[in-house]
């Protein structure tokens, strides 16, 4: 059974994951982002079901494509590079989903834009956090 300390750690990791996903989304939605139109042409796979931590496997599998799309930003100066954000997200995802069981991700038939994709995983984090609090 999960202890209160392990639940607290999971909650904190989810909060950090949520914050970085929201940060990426905010940067993309910035009306001054000249690459937004191009970014929206890329399609992402959405999970058929995302209700448990093991379903983060579906996010993990899309992190490389996400980084490639974020690289389109090509800002003159990055405080954080796309690879910094994706690296941190990857570490958190690996810790949250665990490596004991191998879960085969099932994707929905419809693909999504980067904005829809990020919003889906933001909602996932918020949903899981709400069950822990």
């Amino acid at each position: 059974a999960p202890t209160s300390s392990s639940t607290k750690k999971t909650q904190l990791q989810l909060e950090h994951l949520l914050l970085d996903l929201q940060m990426i989304l905010n940067g993309i939605n910035n009306y001054k982002n000249p690459k937004l139109t191009r970014m929206l042409t890329f399609k992402f796979y959405m999970p058929k079901k995302a209700t448990e931590l093991k379903h983060l496997q579906c996010l993990e599998e899309e992190l490389k494509p996400l980084e490639e799309v974020l690289n389109l930003a090509q800002s003159k100066n990055f405080h954080l590079r796309p690879r910094d954000l994706i690296s941190n997200i990857n570490v958190i995802v690996l810790e949250l989903k665990g490596s004991e069981t191998t879960f085969m991700c099932e994707y929905a038939d419809e693909t999504a834009t980067i904005v829809e994709f990020l919003n889906r995983w933001i909602t996932f984090c918020q949903s899981i956090i709400s069950t822990l609090t």
Partner: nanobody
Framework: EVQLVESGGGLVQPGGSLRLSCAAS????????MGWYRQAPGKGLELVAA???????NYADSVKGRFTISRDNAKNTVYLQMNSLKPEDTAVYYC?????????????WGQGTQVTVSS
């Protein structure tokens, strides 16, 4: 408006350590990047390290393995632990607060704190 108050600068011998702190106040959003840039005499402003509220970090190659950035989200404070300091680390260190991972005109900057590494 966001106000940034830095502390922890000073004079230190080569090989020594310093810890810089920067507290943000005002119109703070939970989703942000805080970090440190520096400007050496006669040089341009350069990134030292930055950290997101979610814990993503970026370090300049020149400080990797020597400097560690961390933050306390509850206190809106960012820290820079500087170890194994070298004379070339001498500069004015500026705290930065941004709402995005890339630079734009909404970024905020502190007044700067002097770090001098000399024997």
């Amino acid at each position: 408006e966001v106000q940034l108050v830095e502390s922890g600068g000073g004079l230190v011998q080569p090989g020594g350590s310093l810890r810089l702190s920067c507290a943000a106040s005002g119109s703070i959003f939970s989703i942000n990047v805080m970090g440190w840039y520096r400007q050496a005499p006669g040089k341009g402003l350069e990134l030292v390290a930055a950290i997101s509220s979610g814990g993503s970090t970026n370090y300049a190659d020149s400080v990797k393995g020597r400097f560690t950035i961390s933050r306390d989200n509850a206190k809106n404070t960012v820290y820079l632990q500087m170890n194994s300091l070298k004379p070339e680390d001498t500069a004015v260190y500026y705290c930065m607060y941004a709402s995005s991972w890339y630079e734009d005109e909404t970024d905020y900057w502190g007044q700067g704190t002097q770090v001098t590494v000399s024997s």
